[in-house]
Interface confidence: low
């Protein structure tokens, strides 16, 4: 006859281990006992327990309330156990010796091997603003045993490195993930994936790009002059800018103070109806934590009847 | 598979607190946070803040004054507590996992009924 | 203060149709944006995040869309167990809204 047992059994931390053990032998062969113990904890075999076919399972203290039988219908010739919540200290050489009759004793080997699968954590980097050279976004580290493997999954551009260390059970990794921040990237997920065997998917930690920025101002209202006279109504001018965090706009004349009546609100400078009082430079201030930026224009206010003349010119001339 | 299970009172006196534990598995509450969100009857939804999976918290700015939200990592529970309740605080209260893109809630628990009355 | 206004507040449809719900915010919130699904009795159920993105196990008829201030959220082909509440929320800063929902029901 012979034993059958596996190379390698493979489980995950937590999770119980089979250590088969499989006496494949003649007609009327009978296995007597099965001894199983570890044979790599350096300290010659270390035993786990003892199958016996008349008196059943003896756990020896070491293992006590860990190590059980498969649960039946078991075959007499079968002398697996089942090992309870394997831990990382179980990992190693196991031996099971069998003795049967007639035939006498056989040995197999196998190598338990425990996974431990990895608790990524992401951590951003500092704050991004635009115009910065290429700064760390985020770096992502997990360590399990094997070592784990770090990615990125993102649309936004940028460069990564990795770098491993090597602890006695297991090893982290841990990935960064530079770029150059544009405020394109506003709203961008950019996300760690790490993969492991001990995992059944791949774990996925996603981290939102916030990119400081503030765009140029300008001022929108003045396109046609012509509707620049005295006596409009609703006359307004609107300062458009864009940022993050979200800007906020203050206007000011720079030949004055605002005249009365002009009511500011927010990006919009509101006039009443325009006199050449209302004519001017203005200034929209537009800031940020980021920055700030500034955008003047000059308002003419026309007097209708002293462009009279002018308008008829403009007719006779086509 | 992922599961949040709450567990509180269905009813509360007037100006008492309330208190919902939501006892999560399937994953870890220090790599993903948890929201908690209500529906008062007949309405929409309503969030009431979040912890994230460091422990830090945000409140709704209409609730920070009587609410807290804590949790324990070993126990995988969060904590949720209310006070001072009032008729209208009368809700379905949720607890909700964080999903993937570090914002949304993509597993929710299956909800707390609270009618506030004497 | 920061508004999320759902449109339309009802909807009737019947099975096969397409219909579309849209949300608009008070600002841009650069996509930060989900949508959720609500039946009766029951707890919501993530759709989409990211404003675009279709959370694990969503069928591909429901869709995403938007930017800045507007998003909206596509069904192709309506199915008998797509009838229910739709909200939509916004993360872009706290309190993050929930838009007032979208009750779509059955024509």
């Known amino acids: 006859g012979e034993l059958e047992t596996s190379d390698v059994v493979t489980v995950v931390l937590g999770q119980d281990a089979k250590l088969p053990c499989f006496y494949r032998g003649d007609s009327g062969e009978q296995v007597g006992q099965v001894a199983w113990a570890r044979v790599d904890a350096g300290e010659g075999a270390q035993e786990l327990a003892l199958l016996h076919s008349k008196y059943g399972l003896h756990v020896s203290p070491a293992y006590e309330g860990r190590v059980e039988q498969p649960p039946p219908p078991r075959n007499p010739l079968d002398g697996s156990v089942l090992l309870r919540n394997a831990v990382q200290a179980d990992e190693g050489e196991y031996e099971c010796r069998v003795s049967t009759f007639p035939a006498g004793s056989f040995q197999a080997r196998l190598r338990l091997r425990v996974l431990v699968p990895p608790l990524p954590s992401l951590n951003p980097g500092p704050a991004l603003e635009e115009g910065q050279g290429l700064t760390l976004a985020a770096s992502c580290t997990a360590e399990g045993s094997p070592a784990p493997s770090v990615t990125w999954d993102t649309e936004v551009k940028g460069t990564t490195s990795s770098r491993s260390f090597k602890h006695s059970r297991s090893a982290a990794v841990t990935s960064e993930f530079h770029l150059v921040p544009s405020r394109s990237m506003n709203g961008q997920p950019l996300t760690c994936v790490v993969s492991h065997p001990g995992l059944l998917q791949d774990q996925r930690i996603t981290h939102i790009l916030h990119v400081s920025f503030l765009a140029e101002a300008s001022v929108r209202g003045l396109e046609d002059q012509n509707l620049w006279h005295i006596g409009r109504e609703g006359a307004m001018l609107k300062c458009l800018s864009e940022g993050q965090p979200p800007p906020s706009y203050n206007w000011t004349r720079l030949d004055g103070p605002l005249p009365s009546g002009v009511r500011v609100d927010g990006d919009t400078l509101g006039f009443p109806p325009l006199t050449t009082e209302h004519s001017g430079i203005y200034v929209c201030h537009v800031s940020n934590e980021f920055s700030s930026r500034d955008s003047q224009v000059t308002v003419d206010v026309l007097d209708p009847q002293e462009d009279s003349g002018k308008q008829v010119d403009l007719v006779s001339a086509s | 598979q992922v599961q949040l299970k709450q567990s509180g009172p269905n009813l509360v006196q007037p100006s008492q607190s309330l208190s919902i534990t939501c006892t999560v598995s399937g994953f870890s509450l220090t790599t993903y946070g948890a929201h908690w969100v209500r529906q008062s009857p007949g309405k929409g939804l309503e969030w009431l803040g979040v912890i994230w999976r460091g422990g830090s918290t945000d409140y709704n700015a209409a609730f920070m004054s009587r609410l807290s939200i804590t949790k324990d990592n070993s126990k995988s529970q969060v904590f949720f507590k209310m006070n001072s309740l009032q008729a209208d605080d009368t809700a379905i209260y949720y607890c909700?996992?964080?999903?993937?893109?570090?914002?949304?809630?993509?597993?929710w628990g299956q909800g707390t009924s609270v009618t506030v009355s004497s | 203060d920061f508004q999320v206004t759902q449109s339309p507040a009802s909807l009737s449809a019947s099975v096969g149709e397409t219909v579309t719900i849209t949300c608009r915010t008070s600002e841009n919130i650069h996509n930060y944006l989900a949508w959720y699904q609500q039946k009766q009795g029951k707890s919501p159920q993530l759709l989409v995040y990211n404003a675009k993105t279709l959370a694990d196990g969503v069928p591909s008829r429901f869709s995403g869309s938007g930017s800045g201030t507007q998003y909206s959220l596509k069904i192709n082909s309506l199915q008998p167990e797509d009838f229910g509440t739709y909200y939509c929320q916004h993360f872009w800063s706290s309190p993050w809204t929930f838009g007032g929902g979208t009750k779509l029901e059955i024509k």
């Open positions: 909700a996992k964080i999903g993937y893109d570090g914002y949304a809630m993509d597993n």
